[in-house]
């Protein structure tokens, strides 16, 4: 921490300039004033302060604002951005989506996303909704931090919004989110026809049911292996072979490659070998011929 | 990420003179704001001791105004730091920076000794 001094008369700060860069940390501690530097926070971003003072600099502010700075500060935090930590941004109320791509364009390639997903997380927040202008900025400035959204963030998407997320922006979502999302993007491209429907709708099918992946297998999409290897396991598990082969098409080779992975392998092990061995691809792990498969856990359900 | 190297420090008795250079790896170098700051010991704060503008425009910190002069020569992609009338409180290691907001990256830094 920085010690507390008195000002020497001669370092007297009354304007936030450049000749600050002269001042050692106890000497920007005693002189400038706290409500001086966030009246004249624009003017921070264009001096060429060290790490170490710009911490003196957020030192002064937090004295200042110890509930959350305002926006008119937040929007001028330039580099003094990467000084704050998820807890600093949590306390901010930030409306203004130009002060969110702001703060994108600076904290581009530095290990700040931790501080990125709260700062979303506080706009979605603030604007009361995940609205069309929000998912704009997000997919123009920081694609895949849609993905750092929690699902009750997620929640608040319009399905009339969803058209404006591109496949790459899901790239880093979870299951959770998917599921969020999944029924919204089925709401939103549901007048569209067979091929363009499952263009749209294949980036968010992570969070689809298996009805749904069944649906698709009458289709004749032709699934590419990593769209169904992003599949929910559970909406995988109870299609048939023939559901399975009619939904990937041509790409139903693309199983042998991934015989040990999940969900592949996981499907594998609930078919009957003789039902594998129709796809002639050389599938092992089913189960074998003449043995008898008891559900048990619809048994517990009836008990 | 620009690399600079800092060179030309060493033992120097009190009210001699020694001559610092940093060159940059940058070829966009003569637009480059340029600093030298000094580290009296491991741990403590670099403070600036000057700083030259692209237009060759010079400030410095009271304690070496008049003994220190920063220069530059843009063919060379190199800033100089020429210091006489050393004191033994001039003593640490010397580092340059390109002045730009954001930019905190440092040389190795070159170690200057003035024994009284």
């Known amino acids: 921490d920085v010690e507390r001094t008195t000002c020497p008369p001669e370092k007297e700060v009354h304007e936030i300039d450049e000749s600050l860069i002269f001042y050692k940390k106890r000497e920007l501690e005693a002189c400038v004033d706290a409500a001086l530097l966030a009246a004249q926070m624009d003017r921070v971003d264009a001096i060429p302060f060290t790490y170490e003072q710009l911490d003196v600099l957020k030192h002064k502010l937090d004295e200042l604002y110890p509930q959350g700075y305002p926006e008119s500060v937040i929007r001028h935090l330039g580099h003094l951005f990467l000084k704050m930590s998820p807890e600093d941004i949590r306390k901010w109320n930030v409306t203004s989506l130009e002060t969110l791509k702001a703060l994108l364009k600076v904290s581009k390639g530095h290990e700040m996303s931790a501080q990125v997903a709260t700062l979303i997380d506080r706009v979605v927040v603030g604007r009361g909704q995940l609205d069309k202008d929000t998912v704009d900025t997000l997919t123009a400035f920081c694609p895949g931090c849609l993905c750092s959204l929690s699902p009750e963030r997620l929640s608040s998407v319009p399905p009339s919004v969803i058209g404006a997320v591109r496949p790459q922006d899901l790239d880093t979502c979870g299951p959770r989110q998917l599921d969020v999302l999944y029924p919204k993007a089925r709401l939103a491209f549901q007048n569209m026809s067979g091929s363009e429907y499952f263009v749209k709708i294949r980036p968010f099918l992570g969070g689809a049911p298996t009805e749904d992946v069944k649906a698709l297998s009458q289709q004749n999409v032709s699934m590419d292996l990593a769209t169904f290897m992003k599949l929910r396991r559970e909406a995988v598990l109870p299609l048939t072979v023939a559901e399975v082969q009619k939904l990937l098409g041509p790409h139903v080779e693309g199983l042998k490659v991934e015989e040990q992975h999940s969900p592949v392998r996981d499907w594998i092990l609930k078919q009957r070998q003789d039902d594998l061995d129709t796809l002639g691809l050389g599938l092992q792990g089913g189960i074998p011929n003449g043995y008898l498969i008891l559900d048990l856990s619809v048994r517990e359900a009836l008990s | 990420q620009v690399q600079l190297v800092e060179s030309g420090g060493g033992l120097v008795q009190a009210g001699g003179s020694l001559r610092l250079s940093c060159t940059a790896s940058?070829?966009?170098?003569?637009?480059?704001?340029m600093g030298w700051y000094r580290q009296e010991a491991p741990g403590k704060e670099r403070e600036l001791v000057a700083?030259?503008?692209?237009?060759?425009?010079?400030n410095y910190a009271d304690s070496v105004k008049g003994r220190f002069t920063i220069s530059r020569d843009n063919a060379k992609n190199t800033v100089y730091l020429q210091m006489n009338s050393l004191k033994s409180e001039d003593t640490g290691v010397y580092y340059c920076?390109?002045?730009?907001?954001?930019?905190?990256?440092w040389g190795q830094g070159t170690q200057v000794t003035v024994s009284s």
């Open positions: 920076r390109i002045m730009r907001p954001g930019n905190w990256y």
């Open positions: 940058e070829s966009g170098f003569s637009a480059n704001y």
């Open positions: 700083t030259i503008n692209r237009f060759g425009s010079t």
